[in-house]
């Protein structure tokens, strides 16, 4: 029977800069029941606080709701593991909410084949930003990436769409069924997961000629 091994805070993520969650990995338990607590202080403070919510993020997590989340202050946090034989602490982790944003995937992905009489046909792709993101404040810039491939192909074709929420693709294989997905990332932070795939059948008469 031993004191617990050193835990590690290995991930922090925020869907929208308004709330965030951090997860830790326990060290060895020393063969005894072990209690974990996350404590933190914010830059410029010495007062330590305990995690406000150990439930929302699942096991070994701490969730910071709106009233506990500030974009302006860095959080300095650590996890304490305690059993009957003693305690161990994780390394301190510095968290700036701006740099942990991972949005939900974009919504309402719509894909349509457009065949104007006077111009080349194209695939028109349109989507909406994730619900939790408020783009109106100006705090957020979302960048988008599209990927598509014929249903049976192995390789994805990637297109960077910048900040726009619609995109045209001209070169496609006629008669093929395509999968299309989109994802987003803030100007700082992490790519979202890919949206659920939308399927589109490219007509056989879809031509890439002038």
């Amino acid at each position: 029977q031993l004191p617990p091994g050193k835990p590690e805070i290995f991930k922090c993520r925020s869907p929208n800069k308004e709330t965030f969650t951090c997860w830790w990995r326990p060290g060895t338990d020393g063969g005894l029941p072990t209690n974990y607590s996350l404590t933190y202080h914010r830059e410029g403070e010495t007062l330590m606080h305990e995690c406000p919510d150990y439930i929302t993020g699942g096991p070994n997590s701490c969730h910071f709701g709106k009233q506990y989340t500030s974009m302006w202050r860095t959080y300095i946090m650590m996890v304490n593991a305690t059993n009957q034989m003693g305690s161990s602490f994780s390394d301190e982790l510095y968290v700036d909410v701006t740099y942990i944003v991972q949005p939900d995937p974009p919504l309402e992905l719509a894909v349509e084949v457009k065949q104007p009489e006077d111009r080349k046909p194209y695939l028109w792709i349109k989507w909406s930003p994730p619900t939790l993101i408020d783009l109106k404040t100006g705090w957020f810039t979302l960048l988008y990436e599209i990927r598509l491939k014929p249903e049976k192909a192995a390789e994805w074709e990637i297109h960077f769409a910048g900040q726009q929420t619609e995109f045209k693709i001209l070169s496609l294989h006629p008669g093929q069924k395509y999968l299309v997905q989109v994802r987003c990332k803030p100007d700082h932070g992490y790519w979202s997961a890919w949206s659920p795939a939308t399927f589109i059948q490219i007509p056989s008469d879809f031509t890439m000629n002038d």
Epitope: F10, K11, C12, R25, T74, V95, T98, Y99, I100, G138
Partner: antibody, heavy 118, light 112 residues
Framework: QVQLQQPGAELVRPGTSVKLSCKAS????????MHWVKQRPGQGLEWIGV????????NYNQKFKGKATLTVNTSSSTAYMHLSSLTSEDSAVYYC???????????WGQGTLVTVSA | DVVMTQTPFSLPVSLGDQASISCRSS???????????LHWYLQKPGQSPKLLIY???NRFSGVPDRFSGSGSGTDFTLKISRVEAEDLELYFC?????????FGGGTKLEIK
């Protein structure tokens, strides 16, 4: 504890290339971005670029595009920087450095001294 | 790129004195999120830099309280209130508000 291990020195010929390594330990390698910084003898520091080990997404200082290429091997928790077409201007100490979830450098490797000489 | 100008290049001080290092940026370091990402690092000969101060005025873990940072916008200062022998090293300011992140040229603190 967090450690970033780098070889002490590399002697290379002009016009060739070199691949510098930075082996991370004491933390989950894919959780934190890895940066590279250049320091020429007796001079200041220059930020080269950063890589996210979880998906290999990179962001480079424009000045080092075409000169430096950042990669990772997640199975060995090692970050690499490939420097190409070496000249005497590339003779410097190269550091790998890790932030937390922040945009400053909390942990630094000891640096690799690259000497480009015929 | 944001140019970081550090003065003086070399600062002779007596032990126990206060030392003051200035850092000026070519544009405002206020980020769109309201934070100012100006940091100070210390480097000893043959070693890698170490973080002293982050976001203008926050001492990093384990940094003695004789080190303090101040400033805003484009003008920043690192003060060492009572210089000790171990402080006679090279100091760099750094900004990470704008990509690429940039550093000052360094200030060497030396004995008068």
């Amino acid at each position: 504890q967090v450690q970033l291990q780098q070889p002490g020195a590399e002697l290379v010929r002009p016009g060739t290339s070199v691949k510098l390594s930075c082996k991370a330990s004491g933390y989950t390698f894919t959780s934190f971005w890895m940066h590279w910084v250049k320091q020429r003898p007796g001079q200041g520091l220059e930020w080269i670029g950063v890589i996210d080990p979880s998906d290999s997404h990179t962001n480079y200082n424009q000045k080092f595009k075409g000169k430096a290429t950042l990669t990772v091997n997640t199975s060995s928790s090692t970050a690499y920087m490939h420097l190409s077409s070496l000249t005497s201007e590339d003779s410097a100490v190269y550091y790998c450095a890790r932030g937390d979830y922040s945009n400053w450098f909390t942990y630094w490797g000891q640096g690799t001294l690259v000497t480009v000489s015929a | 790129d944001v140019v970081m100008t550090q003065t003086p290049f070399s600062l002779p001080v007596s032990l126990g004195d206060q030392a003051s290092i200035s850092c000026r940026s070519s544009q405002s370091l206020v980020h769109s999120n309201g934070n100012t990402y100006l940091h100070w690092y210390l480097q000893k000969p043959g070693q890698s830099p170490k973080l002293l101060i982050y976001k203008v005025s926050n001492r990093f873990s384990g940094v003695p309280d004789r080190f303090s940072g101040s400033g805003s916008g484009t003008d920043f200062t690192l003060k060492i209130s009572r210089v000790e022998a171990e402080d006679l090293e090279l100091y760099f300011c750094s900004q990470s508000t704008h990509v690429p992140w940039t550093f000052g040229g360094g200030t060497k603190l030396e004995i008068k």
